[in-house]
């Protein structure tokens, strides 16, 4: 299995501690990513006064960006394992748009940015090496991406920077939940 | 100041039903990651239940599923612990929390604590 | 729900001893766990999280280590303080506790 980002030599064969299974392999992986956010966060949040905006919603109507709800059996109530597991890939296969969207927004944090793109690529293939149900994701249509990226790039200033934001905070919402559903699993 | 402060609690027969508030000052509960914990006399803490401030997803112990309702109202900075079909074992002093960060890894703000005994 | 089992649960040492608690967990919680100190009438007080991290604030006596399903607290040479009642508590799945290990005075 190869070794993904955030892990090292010492969680594969530290002293005095079991190895890492796949489940923690995988949350580590998120968190890894996470800890990305964070830090693409702050660069937006230095850089413009968009954390506090109370414009969001505005920004918001023209972006479809994956959420998790209820009918995707990925909270307790209602867990379905299967069903939440190809949300999950669905939604991080639906965000690697807006990922690619973020590779020129940054100027401190450009490899930051970077390695959450890919990262997010390694951990699609992991999650989808887990998934029985692979006939029920469905990958969004390569001209429709590039289409949403261009009219993403096109926008003013503004609206860029409100993007860029919302992007982070709803990726790092979706990580979020889907962290607590697969350690579910 | 950041606090929480805890509230409904009482004296309330086998069966019968509850509400517990819990109201933040200091910090928004939407977006922070909120959590009931319950001690009994004399005994240790037991975790009850927690949300998750994204989508509002809930998530509880084993012992309450099906019974207690964990819920929000951002606009009153408020979480609700709603109890129902209570039983003496029930009988602790529940208090809200707040986990600490965005990777909920320790209780960082702890409320006074609300009594609720279940006798008949 | 993850089964927290904490030992001992009563612990009686004396002041400048070096104690051990130990916690284990049900199934695996990675690094996602937590310990708190507790006296009476009052809220638990984090000493520790993510298995290992000291709280800033907390005396540099106070230790965690372990990651997967055995964790342990150690507390390097007892103070007065440090008569309490010591919780851990897992962050993975819901937050449940240990039983508690009550450290007494010999």
């Known amino acids: 299995a190869p070794v993904l980002p955030g892990e090292d030599s010492k969680d594969v064969a530290a002293p005095h501690s079991q190895p890492l299974t796949s489940s923690e392999r995988i949350d580590k992986h998120i968190r890894y990513i996470l800890d990305g956010i964070s830090a693409l966060r702050k660069e937006t949040c230095n850089r413009s006064n968009m954390c506090e905006s109370s414009k969001e919603a505005l920004a918001e109507n023209n972006l479809n960006l994956p959420k998790m709800a209820e009918k995707d059996g990925c909270f307790q109530s209602g867990f379905n394992e299967d069903t939440c597991l190809v949300k999950i890939i669905t939604g991080l296969l639906e965000f690697e748009v807006y990922l690619e969207y973020l590779q020129n927004r940054f100027e401190s944090s450009e490899e930051q940015a970077r390695a959450v793109q890919m990262s997010t690529k390694v951990l699609i293939q992991f999650l989808q090496k887990k998934a029985k149900n692979l006939d029920a994701i469905t990958t969004p249509e390569p001209t429709t991406n590039a289409s949403l990226l261009t009219k993403l790039q096109a926008q003013n200033q503004w609206l860029q920077d409100m993007t860029t934001h919302l992007i982070l905070r709803s990726f790092k919402e979706f990580l979020q939940s889907s962290l607590r559903a697969l350690r579910q699993m | 100041e950041v606090q929480l402060v805890e509230s409904g609690g009482g004296l309330v027969q086998p069966g019968g039903s509850l509400r517990l508030s819990c109201a933040a000052s200091g910090f928004t509960i939407s977006s922070n990651y909120m959590i009931w914990v319950r001690q009994a006399p004399g005994k240790g803490l037991e975790w009850v239940s927690d949300?998750?401030?994204?989508?509002?997803?809930?998530y509880y112990a084993d012992s309450v599923k099906g019974r207690f309702t964990m819920s929000r109202d951002i606009s009153k900075n408020t979480v609700y612990l709603q109890m129902n079909s209570l039983r003496a074992e029930d009988t602790a002093v529940y208090y809200c929390?707040?986990?600490?960060?965005?990777?909920?890894?320790?209780?960082?703000?702890w409320g006074r604590g609300t009594l609720v005994t279940v006798s008949s | 729900d993850i089964q927290m089992t904490q030992s001992p649960s009563t612990l009686s040492a004396s002041v400048g001893d070096r104690v051990t608690i130990t916690c284990r967990a049900s199934q695996g919680i990675s690094s996602w766990l937590a310990w708190y100190q507790q006296k009476p009438g009052k809220a638990p007080k984090v000493l520790i999280y993510?298995?290992?991290t000291l709280e800033s604030g907390v005396p540099s006596r106070f230790s965690g280590s372990g990651s997967g399903t055995e964790f342990t607290l150690t507390i390097s040479s007892l103070q007065p303080d440090d008569f309490a009642t010591y919780y851990c508590?897992?962050?993975?799945?819901?937050?449940?506790f240990g039983q508690g290990t009550k450290l007494e005075i010999k």
């Open positions: 949300l998750y401030y994204y989508a509002g997803d809930t």
């Open positions: 993510k298995a290992s």
């Open positions: 508590q897992q962050s993975w799945l819901g937050g449940s």
């Open positions: 929390a707040r986990w600490a960060d965005d990777h909920p890894a320790w209780v960082d703000l």
